[in-house]
């Protein structure tokens, strides 16, 4: 049992009758060089902005208690499309991806993804073409070069094509996604499949013998039972954001990945609210060091599948689904007919090394406590590039369990919870319009009292 995430994004393109606007061919950019640190950082910030836009909309329209998606997977699918997009369609894709006017987005993204945490990260992309559909050679070459997307011809027999696609998806995600497509539309001309399989290990594993049944607080009134992983002295970077008040912690994976969890101290929050003033810089403040921390984190299994057509339309990509300019792919008109995305995430105790090994050196420092026992948001970042690989929200980690009414004596409300933060030092460094970062001071460690 490991921490695993396997997202898959599918772009379905169908035939579009010629018509609409004429266009000039976009000039090719000089994109072959390795990305500079500045480009990488700029891309990480852009990806974070795209993540916030995309996830806010997904959360607004979803009724699921838990959500997960891979913005990187969606961005890769869209940037693959951008390889063949022209004029307004290309401009829109760049704007939605916050990529400015740089033509090198597909090259940058694919290059950075090639270098992502070896062993933890497997990127697979494949293109399925309608039998005999004329695709431009240049697009085929670039697709293969950048995304490893060797074109595969559809047979035209629905059952066979479906079986082949689902088999490939299953293999590409190491069995995590078994039945991705249940049907293929008759007029499918081009399928872009983009699968990312993430398999992370905590840098400091949790001791399974400490995992026990505990309460996860859904709101002021109700809890659900969860399997809560625990560590007594876990080396953790954490800090407090103000307005709204959010506890943030960075749990390191091996292979330069981080699980960043955001726990709002109030129950009344929505994803859009939290993400509104959240930027890459807010989540990566300088001068926040690892501390030995008493940690409680629920074991998780999340799976979410969605069609992103409506969401991407709301983001400003309506054109893709009505009359896009994709003449870099083919002179015959194409239209995107579907954007399917699926991710699964599993969090358990396994890791690389025992936490005790690191905590010995830190044992003289005062101890704090970080409990993830109320609704939270999370990101998985690749630390070298700063790219957000996944984003998710957990309202109820055990939706099949019956809710339990809190007993008054053991359910401190927000008032008590916030009272326990009173001794926490207040910083005044501003991030964005009204987001304050409050780093914990070296000497000053209150017990971070969450509901027990």
């Amino acid at each position: 049992n490991q921490e695993q995430v396997s997202p898959l994004t599918l772009l379905k393109l169908g035939n579009q009758e010629p018509g609409g606007q004429t266009a000039l061919k976009s000039p090719p950019g000089v994109c072959s060089r390795d990305p500079t640190p500045e480009q990488t950082h700029r891309l990480a910030r852009a990806m974070m902005a795209f993540t916030a836009d995309l996830f806010s909309l997904v959360a607004q329209t979803s009724t699921c208690p838990n959500l997960i998606l891979s913005p990187l997977s969606v961005a890769l699918a869209l940037s693959h499309l951008a390889l063949g997009a022209q004029n307004h369609t290309l401009q829109r894709l760049q704007q939605v991806l916050h990529a400015g006017s740089g033509p090198c987005l597909p090259h940058l993204l694919s290059r950075l993804c090639q270098d992502l945490g070896p062993g933890a990260f497997r990127l697979a992309a494949r293109m399925y073409l309608q039998k005999g559909f004329p695709i431009k050679e240049d697009f085929l070459e670039q697709s293969e070069q950048l995304f490893g997307a060797k074109p595969v011809s559809l047979t035209g027999k629905q059952e066979d094509d479906l079986a082949n696609i689902n088999q490939w998806v299953k293999e590409a995600t190491e069995g995590k996604i078994q039945e991705f497509l249940s049907g293929l539309p008759e007029d499918t001309v081009l399928l872009l499949l983009n699968a990312i399989h993430f398999q992370g290990f905590w840098r400091n594993k949790f001791d399974p013998s400490l995992t026990q049944r505990d309460s996860f607080h859904l709101d002021e009134q109700f809890t659900v039972p969860v399997e809560m992983m625990q560590a007594r002295t876990y080396p953790l970077r954490w800090f407090l954001l103000e307005q709204p008040e959010i506890q943030v912690a960075h749990f390191p994976f091996k292979n330069n990945m981080s699980f960043v969890v955001l726990v709002p101290t109030h129950f009344e929050w929505n994803v859009s609210q939290v993400l509104a003033n959240l930027s890459w810089d807010t989540l990566h403040p300088p001068l926040v060091w690892e501390r030995p921390t008493k940690v409680r984190l629920p074991k998780l299994y999340l799976k979410h599948q969605m069609d992103l057509v409506a969401t991407l339309s709301q983001l400003g990509l309506q054109e893709l689904f009505q009359a896009p300019d994709l003449r870099g792919i083919s002179e015959q008109s194409l239209v995107v007919s579907g954007v399917q995305h699926q991710s699964t995430l599993e969090l358990s105790e396994v890791g690389v090394e025992a936490a005790a090994a690191t905590s010995i050196a830190m044992s003289r420092m005062s101890l704090s406590s970080f409990s993830v026992n109320r609704p939270f948001l999370f990101f998985i970042f690749e630390d070298t590039t700063g790219l957000p690989l996944f984003v998710g929200s957990v309202r109820n980690p055990n939706p099949s369990a019956p809710r339990e009414l809190k007993e008054q004596q053991d359910s401190p409300g927000n008032k008590d919870f916030l009272q326990s933060l009173k001794g926490f030092p207040r910083g005044d460094k501003l991030f964005g319009p009204d987001l304050k970062l409050v780093p914990p001071m070296e000497e000053d460690y209150p017990q971070f009292g969450s509901p027990k």
Epitope: Q95, Q318, Q322
Partner: antibody, heavy 119, light 107 residues
Framework: QIQLVQSGAEVKKPGASVKISCKAS????????MNWVRQAPGQGLEWMGW????????TYAEEFKGRFTFTLDTSTSTAYLEIRSLRSDDTAVYFC????????????WGQGTTVTVSS | DIQMTQSPSSLSASVGDRVTITCRAS??????LAWYQQKQGKSPQLLVY???TLASGVPSRFSGSGSGTDFTLTISSLQPEDFGSHYC?????????FGGGTKLEIK
């Protein structure tokens, strides 16, 4: 030449339904999205939403979700707007307008259909 | 949702005058803005799209400018047929809202 021709004026009682048509000619119907716009007497223009003429998928502005439905008949190049449970504040002129991706504008408009809701 | 604020709401001017109508978006809409003219009892007509491109058949006295959040429609020398209401509309994320309109009247 390109034309959007809408159905005639309607007078309805509160609680009734109405279905307005917008017939397109002079271009390939499925290449351009169709918008619906409302204009109450003496007021400005209100964007109600649009329908993807290729997939048939509608997008509604928040205040037009529920009682309003956009549909298509691609065989006759016609878009429809249906309003259910009519109220007096639905009294307005309703326009259909063609959306052009790439230029991002509504370049051709129907002549408008006046709907009067009165008891 | 992006709100569009148009000013002024009404304007009296004489034939030959230079007239400027402004439209402000509550968020960055890049150059995805259109201007329309509507005469009493008629359908709106497209004047300008993509903030500054003149629609076909529109006289060159009309011009559009701006990008991001602030946009302007200018009529360099007002003609009798230019009177009526003028509306801006954004095309960034849905809903594609209109401005409140500017009623241009003869002085």
């Amino acid at each position: 030449q390109i034309q959007l021709v809408q159905s005639g004026a309607e007078v309805k009682k509160p609680g009734a339904s109405v279905k307005i048509s917008c017939k397109a000619s002079g271009y390939t119907f499925t290449n351009y999205g169709m918008n619906w716009v409302r204009q109450a007497p003496g007021q400005g223009l209100e964007w109600m939403g649009w329908i993807n003429t290729k997939s048939g998928e509608p997008t509604y502005a928040e205040e037009f979700k529920g009682r309003f439905t956009f549909t298509l008949d691609t065989s006759t190049s016609t878009a429809y707007l249906e309003i259910r449970s009519l109220r007096s504040d639905d009294t307005a002129v309703y326009f259909c307008a063609r959306w052009v991706p790439g230029t991002y504008a509504m370049d051709y408009w129907g002549q408008g259909t006046t709907v009067t809701v009165s008891s | 949702d992006i709100q569009m604020t148009q000013s002024p709401s009404s304007l009296s001017a004489s034939v030959g005058d230079r007239v400027t109508i402004t439209c402000r978006a509550s968020g960055n809409i890049h150059n995805y803005l259109a201007w329309y003219q509507q005469k009493q009892g008629k359908s709106p007509q497209l004047l300008v799209y993509n903030a500054k491109t003149l629609a076909s058949g529109v006289p060159s006295r009309f011009s559009g400018s701006g990008s991001g959040t602030d946009f302007t429609l200018t009529i360099s020398s007002l003609q009798p047929e230019d009177f009526g209401s003028h509306y801006c509309q954004h095309f960034w994320t849905t809903p594609w809202t209109f401005g409140g309109g500017t009623k241009l009247e003869i002085k």
